[in-house]
Interface confidence: medium
């Protein structure tokens, strides 16, 4: 008996069906398979969990989180013994092993490994102004997503004709920051942060509108 | 694997109307930022119109040439982008691509492109 | 209307270095991009934001953009970078992007 190489992993958007690829070739009827999927969660590396098994010609469940999400993706018994994961959750993030057993057949390799990553869009960023919005002030804008794997990225536009920031500012895409160093007059206006990664972008709006002095009345 | 697949191409006649979907699948299509480009046959590439997701306001912009004649619209619940053509004009005979703007908002490149649909407009 | 020039061709031999041009109005005060287009084949987006590369593009490919004119640099050029490349300036709140003619590069 021999399981098939199984690509590394599979990336799946939380929410979305993944299918685990497990195939082998054997020399026996299948007439006693038997099929066990496991998964070392990436949140609980200690704990292995059974996510399905095939014996004796029956499915049986594995733990309780994967009820009524998880199947076969064919008719069983076969040689093709890939599962399906309906409504990818975050924890479903892990290592998943397909053990196969095909009596009499024994020796060769009987293990299958995949590893599973559930990815999930930036949530709304928040978009806040820090400092003073005074004349000559130096400001930072902030944007920041709560939920993004894999980590989102975060880029700053200004709404206006050219999209590009004044040439007194940084950005930093990884903290999602832009320092604006002597604002001006010229530094007003609309800001937009665009929080993405593999799977999505999510935006926020700001508006920076810098304040003059007001003359002083003699 | 983030993907888009077009279809709905086809030959019409002038004056005719076409709608053209675009299937969304690898990404979570609602948050996207969606975009039609078209290319006549050899000749190089003209952006269509986009549509806003509905968080962003779901507003659409338009070429001129196509401006009152299509419209641009998305469900996100079947992950799927449309382009409805009317008043069709020789002119509009091209391939017909569905892309996601990717790596920022408006100054963010398009990033996949769909496989291309063929409308051609012919009497 | 905004235009955007590109020359029609350019040539280079393999392992050198191929620079495509993009010129417009005060280009560099907006964003470029770069479209790979091989015969038969949906355009590939190669530079985005004046500079960027999105995953998966070479590192022989960078770009560059300031004045009237942004620039798509192909470094050790090989037989497979042949196609068809369009530049294209980012448009704005209220207006769509502009693509170049398209230049085809030719690897000798």
């Known amino acids: 008996l021999e399981v098939s190489e199984s690509p590394g992993s599979v990336q799946v958007a939380r929410g979305q069906t993944a299918v685990l690829p497990c195939a082998f070739s054997t020399s026996a009827a299948l007439l006693n398979l038997n099929v066990i999927w496991m998964v070392i969660p990436l949140s609980n590396a200690n704990q292995p969990e059974q996510v399905i098994l095939y014996q004796g010609g029956q499915m049986f469940d594995g733990a309780l989180r994967f009820h009524g999400r998880v199947g076969f993706t064919g008719t069983m018994p076969a040689t093709n013994v890939s599962i399906f994961i309906n409504n990818t959750q975050l924890s479903d993030t892990g290592t998943y092993q397909c053990l196969v057993n095909n009596l009499p057949d024994r020796g060769g390799r009987n293990i299958g490994v995949t590893g599973l990553t559930v990815l999930v869009p930036p949530s709304a960023p928040q978009c806040q102004i820090q400092g003073s919005q005074d004349l000559g002030s130096d400001v930072i804008l902030l944007c920041s997503s709560e939920e993004g794997i894999p980590r989102p990225t975060y880029l700053w536009e200004k709404l206006d004709n050219t999209l590009k920031l004044p040439p007194t500012a940084t950005q930093d895409q990884v903290q999602g920051t832009v320092t604006i160093r002597n604002i001006s007059a010229l530094s007003s206006g609309l800001y937009q942060c665009v929080a993405s990664n593999a799977i999505g972008t999510s935006t926020c709006l700001l508006d920076l509108q810098v304040i003059s002095p007001q003359p002083r009345s003699v | 694997e983030v993907q888009l697949v077009e279809s709905g191409g086809g030959l019409v006649k002038p004056g005719g109307s076409l709608r053209l979907s675009c299937a969304a699948s690898?990404?979570?299509?609602?948050?996207?930022?969606m975009s039609w480009v078209r290319q006549a046959p050899g000749k190089g590439l003209e952006w269509v119109g986009r549509?806003?997701?509905?968080?962003?306001?779901?507003?659409?912009d338009y070429a001129a040439p196509v401006k009152g004649r299509f419209t641009i619209s998305r469900d996100d619940s079947k992950n799927t982008l449309y382009l409805q053509m009317n008043s069709l004009k020789t002119e509009d005979t091209a391939v017909y691509y569905c892309?996601?703007?990717?790596?920022?908002?408006?100054?963010?490149?398009?990033?996949?492109w769909g496989q291309g649909t063929l409308v051609t407009v012919s009497s | 209307s905004y235009e955007l020039t590109q020359p029609p061709s350019v040539s280079v031999s393999p392992g050198q270095t191929a620079s495509i041009t993009c010129s417009g109005d005060?280009?560099?005060?907006?964003?470029a991009s770069w479209y790979q287009q091989k015969p038969g084949q949906s355009p590939v987006l190669v530079i985005y934001?004046?500079?960027k590369r999105p995953s998966g593009i070479p590192e022989r490919f960078s770009g560059s953009n300031s004045g009237n004119t942004a620039t798509l640099t192909i470094s050790g050029t090989q037989a497979e970078d042949e196609a068809d490349y369009y530049c294209?300036?980012?448009?704005?709140?209220?207006?769509?992007?502009?693509f170049g003619g398209g230049t085809k590069l030719t690897v000798l």
């Open positions: 294209s300036s980012t448009g704005t709140a209220h207006t769509l992007a502009v």
């Open positions: 892309a996601r703007v990717a790596h920022g908002g408006y100054s963010g490149g398009l990033d996949p």
């Open positions: 549509i806003k997701s509905k968080t962003d306001g779901g507003t659409t």
């Open positions: 934001q004046d500079s």
């Open positions: 005060k280009l560099g005060d907006k964003y």
């Open positions: 690898g990404f979570t299509f609602s948050n996207a930022w």
